[in-house]
């Protein structure tokens, strides 16, 4: 047969669906790999073919579209499960072809079991909301296309295992869940269960969003260097170990890149001949403010090392900060080298 453009296994699309729930999966070819959409391809005489490889098997096999109640069907560029079964897990391939052209891509589909409290191996999207902000809304995700707009599904929201009824600052409004003046105690997994009828059957869609309450933009600041500071002097004798922590506080800023680095006499540690070790640790507050500590250490400090200028630098999207460490040789009356 003719050569086929094989895009391989698209592991970027790790599709997870819950067992015993409907699932609609679009062929990724038209979303990520080809410049035209399904309608254009179809009107050009191209056919979309589906097949799959079961979990822990190597054999590709056609998908059985003749199951009872049309459990698996194809509609345009969508593969439908009404509903999924655990053993539907595997790698699915969609192939677009005619007599002269062929393009295909595979993607993994995992059917996941959940317990009565919605606990599962499913990876949930994270929604960050600002603390004390007025109103935040989250919307039940990935339910578009499952039922026509004429159908009004019932929606029930849960926090963890508890149905959201009379929560003081969390209000269910159909597909939306509103948070009024959120606090850290609003952190958690929020699940919407959407129930809709189709051909005399009731189907359930379960979707979970992890809510994380973070620091507000109004509280965002440039980095604050706690250490080194002007109050602490690092007084050492030659041969002793010199340890200077650079401890920096970064308020939470969405998508900010927080940096901390040392310079020695204006150069990066890698560019000086001193035998320096730098260890970094990071801790987070409840609102994802970050404290980043870089410890600079010299095992056996020399008189020359004790005359160098050690400066801690920090940067985020709000600005920069720097602070020199006060280093001196024990017995010396000043930080400047003595001239005899």
């Amino acid at each position: 047969s003719e050569r086929c453009d094989d895009w391989g296994l698209d592991t970027m699309r790790q599709i997870q669906v819950f067992e015993d729930e409907p699932a609609r999966i679009k062929c990724p070819l038209f979303e990520h790999f080809l410049k035209y959409n399904y309608s254009t391809a179809h009107s050009s005489g191209l056919t979309l073919i589906w097949y799959w490889t079961r979990q822990d098997r190597d054999l590709e096999e056609p998908i059985n579209f003749r199951l009872p109640e049309n459990r698996i069907s194809k509609e345009k560029d969508v593969l439908w499960f009404r509903p999924t079964l655990l053993n539907d897990t595997g790698n699915y391939t969609c192939m677009l072809r005619n007599t002269t052209y062929c393009s295909k891509v595979a993607f993994p589909l995992e059917v996941v079991q959940k317990d009565s409290c919605f606990n599962s191996a499913m990876r949930f999207p994270v929604h960050k909301m600002y603390i004390e902000h007025g109103i935040h809304k989250i919307t039940c995700p990935n339910v578009d296309g499952y039922f026509p707009s004429s159908v009004k599904p019932s929606v029930t929201w849960y926090k963890g295992c508890t149905e959201i009824v009379d929560f003081h600052n969390v209000l269910p409004e159909g597909m939306n869940l509103s948070f009024f003046i959120p606090l850290v105690s609003n952190n958690g997994n929020y699940t919407c269960v959407v129930t809709y009828p189709e051909n005399g059957r009731l189907f359930h869609l379960t979707r979970t969003v992890t809510v994380k309450v973070v620091g507000s933009p109004k509280d965002a600041l440039p980095p604050q260097i706690y250490s080194p500071n002007d109050r602490v002097v690092y007084e050492k004798e030659p041969g002793e170990e010199l340890v200077i922590p650079c401890k920096v506080y970064f308020s939470f800023i969405m998508d900010s890149h927080n940096e901390v680095w040392w310079t020695i006499d204006g150069k990066k540690p890698d560019d000086v001949t001193v035998d320096i070790t730098i260890n970094e640790s990071v801790s987070y507050s409840s609102t994802e403010d970050e404290t980043r500590t870089q410890i600079l250490s010299i095992k056996k400090v020399t008189p020359e090392d004790l005359r160098r200028n050690y400066v801690c630098h920090a940067r985020n999207t709000k600005g920069e900060a720097e602070q020199a460490a006060k280093v001196k040789q024990k017995g010396n009356g000043c930080t400047e080298p003595m001239t005899l």
């Epitope: 004390e132 902000h133 007025g134 109103i135 009024f180 850290v184």
Partner: antibody
């Protein structure tokens, strides 16, 4: 210096209305959530209502929900509490208080007395 | 709603002595607990926030401890100006709730 100054209290008949104001100064008013807390004569403190720094989010104690409305005007550095359908049990000193999640109610006004009586 | 229970209702202490006030929450409030002092005819004043951090200008004789459901305010050596009513308040969950107060009086 942070200052919160309540006004608008007084004697009102049951079923009547009153509007309290709280004038803020000495800080960036628009950066803080604001609250009303009340204290009935000889009793403890009761949180009444909160409004977010941007004015969009409001919350109320069940005892006043549907009767009281909190609002703010950040351009005037002023917090308001519109109280309708007042009852005898709403008699209290009403305090406005500044709130930050990190520091709780760190500043309070001196209070204004609301008396609901026929 | 989280119920805050303070004990004792009244504490009789001599000046210079230590006073220990308790506050219990009906469910965990993490460390989101504050203590306030109120004198007759005055507004409450913040003493402690975050269960253990002293507010600006509060003397070191005031200290707070605890997390979760059990909290303590300690006044190490009572001064004459410390005789007042003390309230705990949780700000972990809406609605925010106060304890009923502990009155510290002169013995």
């Amino acid at each position: 210096e942070v200052q919160l100054l309540e006004s608008g209290g007084g004697l009102v008949q049951p079923g009547g209305s009153l509007r309290l104001s709280c004038a803020a100064s000495g800080f960036t008013f628009a950066e803080y959530a604001m609250n009303w807390v009340r204290q009935a004569p000889g009793k403890g403190l009761e949180w009444v209502s909160a409004i977010s720094y941007d004015g969009e989010g409001t919350l109320y104690a069940d005892s006043v929900k549907g009767r009281f409305t909190i609002s703010r005007d950040n351009s005037k550095n002023t917090l308001y509490l519109q109280m309708n359908s007042l009852r005898a049990e709403d008699t209290a000193v009403y305090y406005c208080a500044r709130f930050r999640y990190y520091t709780a109610f760190d500043y309070w006004g001196q209070g204004t007395l609301v008396t609901v009586s026929s | 709603e989280i119920v805050m229970t303070q004990s004792p209702a009244t504490l009789s202490v001599s000046p210079g002595e230590r006073a220990t006030l308790s506050c219990r929450a009906s469910q965990s409030v993490s460390s989101n607990l504050a203590w306030y002092q109120q004198k007759p005819g005055q507004a409450p004043r913040l003493l402690i926030y975050g269960a253990s951090t002293r507010a600006t200008g509060i003397p070191a004789r005031f200290s707070g401890s605890g997390s979760g459901t059990e909290f303590t305010l300690t006044i190490s050596s009572l001064q004459s100006e410390d005789f007042a009513v003390y309230y705990c308040q949780q700000y972990n969950n809406w609605p925010w709730t106060f304890g009923q107060g502990t009155k510290v009086e002169i013995k």
